[in-house]
């Protein structure tokens, strides 16, 4: 004669609230001849939940008809779940007694969960913009899921990071959970096209996580380097300097000339390129006059970019012999 | 053991609706989710989108959104696809397929297969 | 969307063999890349999952490799079980774009 087992397949069963439960139990023998019972809990201070031959149950439910002589399916559905029911659940056997029925066996329970999805991912960034080779902190929160126990993965461009801090309130037992988590990213210089990236995976989600992203571009400043220069050829009576600001981020940048300390207001030509790694380069051209009187002309390039502190370049103009010659006599 | 067993071919005219049935046994059908697979007479596969059992949420491909719809019927196991206004070109191989994922929640691919359904449409 | 491309798109081999089929995504999809088998006429089988993990029950004769856009599935010493046709599918967000597939033969 085959022992009998009591088979709940489930060991965690996520539910909705308002939604219909399935509680799975079968038994693989029809004896001892005695019920079966549904209980939550386990000791003296265990629910019933349902018994087909007493009582009122009427949010229960049986999945099959316990009145059929070979049944051996003993699942019941609760309807209208709510936080209340959560609980483990327990199909027990009972062997027909006089003058009371004794319990036999009980099958290994289903832990009954409310199941609630994560809320997408928000990442936020820092307050103020930082240079590379320094360490910027990011966040990400996530709220209202259930049950607690969840995944949070943090990428820079697909790869990913390992130096990060994460927290699951409350601690104790909830209806619904928050996930926040702070990850360190170093900052490289060509940073200004990517992106973080919180991945928060759930057992609601059934594999496909949830995503937020933050781009590096909001928390990083790439300071620029400058490089002043005087070009070979002049025009006429004026040597053409130029100014290079190379590789800064963000754009904003206030370029001014001065000549022998003294600022230069007039109009000068530039032009804004932007490169592969998102980064801005700007060349400024400025005009000088050249005449005899001018033997030390110092110029100045100062740039000053995103509210930072002013960084300049100096230049002292090589203006030879021959060119003070070409410019007096050009000089009517 | 698990399965997922599929309704039987279908023959439908052009402008009618076809309702194919995915039956999950051997787990928790909640558990998992439900993806759906067309497969055209000597053709590749394409995945038209998923429904999640437990919100009850479908994400659908571009191609199949509008007529093509996915429905559950927890209770009993079975996930659905109900194709409206069919057409010849949707004559296919459909099938169902449960959604895996690692101990982290992650899904990596496609565990369990019904055997598929056929449906032929013709006027 | 992100497309994947198989190459070849067919392939005729003798029993003991070794084969490479190749998939190539259309952008980075890091290592979320999953291969199927499929016998004419049957569903696909689950073969090769996250670009190089086997998926339970399946020989070690075959083996996946790569990552980022570049990946390959190797069947060494091909048994007469393993003739079909073979998917890639890619996991990397929405939608999962399955490869043209390869249809391998006995030659």
């Known amino acids: 004669e085959e022992e009998l087992q009591m088979i709940q397949p489930e060991k965690l069963l996520l539910v909705t609230v308002g939604k219909t439960a399935t509680l799975h139990c079968t038994v693989t023998s029809l004896l001892p001849v005695g019920p079966v019972l549904w209980f939550r809990g386990v000791g003296p201070g265990r629910e019933l939940i349902y018994n087909q031959k007493e009582g009122h149950f009427p949010r229960v439910t049986t999945v099959s008809d316990l009145t059929k002589r070979n049944n051996m399916d003993f699942s019941i559905r609760i309807s209208s779940i709510t936080p209340a029911d959560v609980g483990t659940y327990y199909c027990v056997k009972f062997r027909k007694g006089s003058p009371e029925n004794v319990e036999f066996k009980s099958g290994p329970g289903t832990e009954m969960a409310l199941g609630a999805k994560p809320s997408a991912p928000v990442v936020l960034g820092p307050a103020a913009r930082t240079t590379p080779e320094h360490t910027v902190s990011f966040t990400c929160e996530s709220h209202g899921f259930s049950p607690r126990d969840i995944t949070l993965k943090w990428f820079k461009n697909g790869n990913e990071l390992s130096d990060f801090q994460t927290n699951v309130d409350p601690t104790g037992q909830s209806v619904a959970y928050s996930i926040r988590s702070t990850a360190r990213v170093v900052l490289d210089p060509w940073d200004v096209r990517s992106q973080v990236i919180c991945e928060v995976a759930h057992v609601t989600l059934q594999g496909d996580p949830l995503r937020g992203t933050a781009n590096l571009s909001e928390a990083i400043r790439v300071p620029p380097t400058l490089e002043v220069t005087q070009q070979p050829m002049r025009v006429g009576n004026q040597v053409n300097v130029t100014c290079q600001v190379r590789k800064f981020y963000p754009q904003s940048l206030q370029l001014t000339w001065s000549e022998n300390g003294n600022v230069c207001q007039r109009e000068t030509a530039s032009t804004l390129t932007e490169n592969k790694d998102g980064t801005y380069n700007w060349t400024s051209w400025f005009l000088v006059n050249i005449s005899d009187q001018r033997d030390d002309v110092v110029l100045t390039c100062q740039v000053k970019h995103d509210g930072q502190l002013a960084v300049s370049k100096r230049l002292a103009l090589e203006v030879t012999v021959h060119q003070k010659d070409q410019s007096s006599d050009a000089t009517p | 053991q698990i399965q997922l067993v599929q309704s039987g071919p279908e023959l439908k005219k052009p402008g009618e609706t076809v309702k194919i049935s995915c039956k999950a046994s051997?787990?928790?059908?909640?558990?998992?989710?439900v993806n759906w697979v067309k497969q055209g007479p000597g053709k590749d596969l394409q995945w038209m989108g998923w429904?999640?059992?437990?919100?009850?949420?479908?994400t659908y491909v571009e191609d199949f959104k509008g007529r093509f719809a996915f429905s559950l019927e927890t209770s009993a196991s079975t996930a659905y696809l109900q194709i409206n206004n069919l057409k010849n070109e949707d004559s296919s191989t459909y099938f169902c397929?449960?959604?895996?994922?690692?101990?982290?929640?992650?899904?990596?691919?496609?565990?369990?297969w019904g055997q598929g359904t056929s449906v032929t449409v013709s006027s | 969307d992100i497309q994947m491309t198989q190459s070849p798109a067919s392939l005729s081999a003798s029993v003991g063999e070794t084969v490479t089929i190749t998939c190539r995504a259309s952008?980075?999809?890091?290592?979320?890349l999953t291969w199927y088998k499929q016998k004419q006429g049957k569903s696909p089988q689950l073969l090769v999952y996250?670009?190089?993990t086997l998926a339970e029950g399946v020989p070690s004769r075959f083996s996946g490799s790569g990552s980022g856009t570049q990946f390959s599935l190797k069947i060494n010493s091909l048994q007469p079980e393993d003739f079909g046709s073979y998917y890639c599918?890619?996991?990397?967000?929405?939608?999962?774009?399955f490869g043209g597939g390869t249809k391998l033969e006995i030659k």
């Open positions: 397929a449960r959604g895996a994922y690692d101990a982290y929640y992650y899904y990596y691919g496609m565990d369990y």
């Open positions: 051997g787990y928790t059908f909640t558990d998992y989710g």
């Open positions: 429904v999640n059992t437990n919100t009850r949420e479908s």
């Open positions: 952008e980075n999809i890091y290592s979320y």
């Open positions: 996250n670009a190089k």
């Open positions: 599918q890619h996991h990397y967000g929405s939608p999962r774009t």
